[in-house]
Amino acid sequence: QAVPPYASENQTCRDQEKEYYEPQHRICCSRCPPGTYVSAKCSRIRDTVCATCAENSYNEHWNYLTICQLCRPCDPVMGLEEIAPCTSKRKTQCRCQPGMFCAAWALECTHCELLSDCPPGTEAELKDEVGKGNNHCVPCKAGHFQNTSSPSARCQPHTRCENQGLVEAAPGTAQSDTTCKNPLEPLPPEMSGTMLM
């Protein structure tokens, strides 16, 4: 089995990931591994010479680039935050800041926007990946409530008055908790919607 550089008449190389066709000499040469770049091009008698990317630069894939890409920080103005640093083998890893979702995508997220509020009685449907899309609000399931307008508030189970030695004065709704009262006291009209102890 030939090792690079080797002649190729059909302009293809055996290992497409780690080799490339060099048209000038009609040969297959080695690509440089991630974290490196081509410091000397191949010839008929000498394979590609690779060198390590300098600090603050990277190449993610097997390549025949003569330079490394410059590391760039995530752009906080675009609502992005950093989850992992740039290394010689990978670019800076970014994601939307908490409370935001990706609004513009070009190979990777370029711009995040604030998540929409979910109104009382609803909560944001849980997604597989945080920050991938805007909120889709779904009603609280039976026996639960949510009483704010918020992008992140979760529906909570209604209070069970009997667990506190109290009795139910008013049932809970999707937007409000159960109202409890002391079993010995009648509920004054002005106190409806609150819990009396």
Partner: antibody, heavy 116, light 107 residues
Framework: QVQLVQSGAEVKKPGESVKVSCKAS????????LHWVRQAPGQCLEWMGW????????QYNEKFKGRVTITADKSTSTAYMELSSLRSEDTAVYYC?????????WGQGTTVTVSS | DIQMTQSPSSLSASVGDRVTITCKAS??????VAWYQQKPGKAPKLLIS???YRYSGVPSRFSGSGSGTDFTLTISSLQPEDFATYFC?????????FGCGTKVEIK
């Protein structure tokens, strides 16, 4: 050559704040992340956060969020780390460090003692 | 957060000995691990980055290996100046985390 020179030792009372400086030289200050790491006596090294002086954006370890503020002054190539609401557990050596696949460059460290 | 569990916490060895220190990450960190040497009253010094790459000026007796979750620092023949504390660190994801150190003492 790359140098990071930190301010001198500090003694503080619980509840006070401390601000430690880190003056960088020998490289382009705005294009490298500067981190802060602390080492309490007999404890593990703890990463606190970083600043990217190019856009003066900082990111913090959740553990210190709300208490730590990292800033940078491009005109003097100096980074600052301010820690507020100090408690005795904050007694430590605080280091600034420049990152690239680890921390190849460190300041000499600043001892902060919190005692009533 | 990713935990870096380093072992042993201390060891006694003689000049010329081969010393091995291990570090286990609580989740996959690829090869994004660094090793440091620290002497009392001094800042840590970078020895190894990317799990196995010796930093410039570091003697060849220091070597690193591993990927994923298991990493090793080896000193092939311990020298008098190597008695110090050694730390591992992951820089795969924030927050960066460190092992709690291995103190290498003279037997």
């Amino acid at each position: 050559q790359v140098q990071l020179v930190q301010s001198g030792a500090e003694v503080k009372k619980p509840g006070e704040s401390v601000k430690v400086s880190c003056k960088a030289s020998g490289y382009t200050f705005t294009t490298y992340y500067l981190h802060w790491v602390r080492q309490a006596p007999g404890q593990c090294l703890e990463w606190m956060g970083w600043i990217y002086p190019g856009n003066v954006h900082a990111q913090y370890n959740e553990k210190f969020k709300g208490r730590v503020t990292i800033t940078a002054d491009k005109s003097t190539s100096t980074a600052y780390m301010e820690l507020s609401s100090l408690r005795s557990e904050d007694t430590a050596v605080y280091y600034c460090a420049r990152s690239w696949e680890g921390f190849p460059y460190w300041g000499q460290g600043t001892t902060v003692t919190v005692s009533s | 957060d990713i935990q870096m569990t380093q072992s042993p916490s201390s060891l006694s060895a003689s000049v010329g000995d081969r010393v091995t220190i291990t570090c286990k990450a609580s989740q996959n960190v690829g090869i994004n691990v660094a090793w440091y040497q620290q002497k009392p009253g001094k800042a840590p010094k970078l020895l190894i980055s990317s799990a196995s790459y010796r930093y410039s000026g570091v003697p060849s007796r220091f070597s690193g290996s591993g990927s994923g979750t298991d990493f090793t620092l080896t000193i092939s023949s311990l020298q008098p100046e190597d008695f110090a504390t050694y730390f591992c660190q992951q820089y795969d994801t924030y927050p960066f985390t460190f092992g709690c150190g291995t103190k290498v003492e003279i037997k």
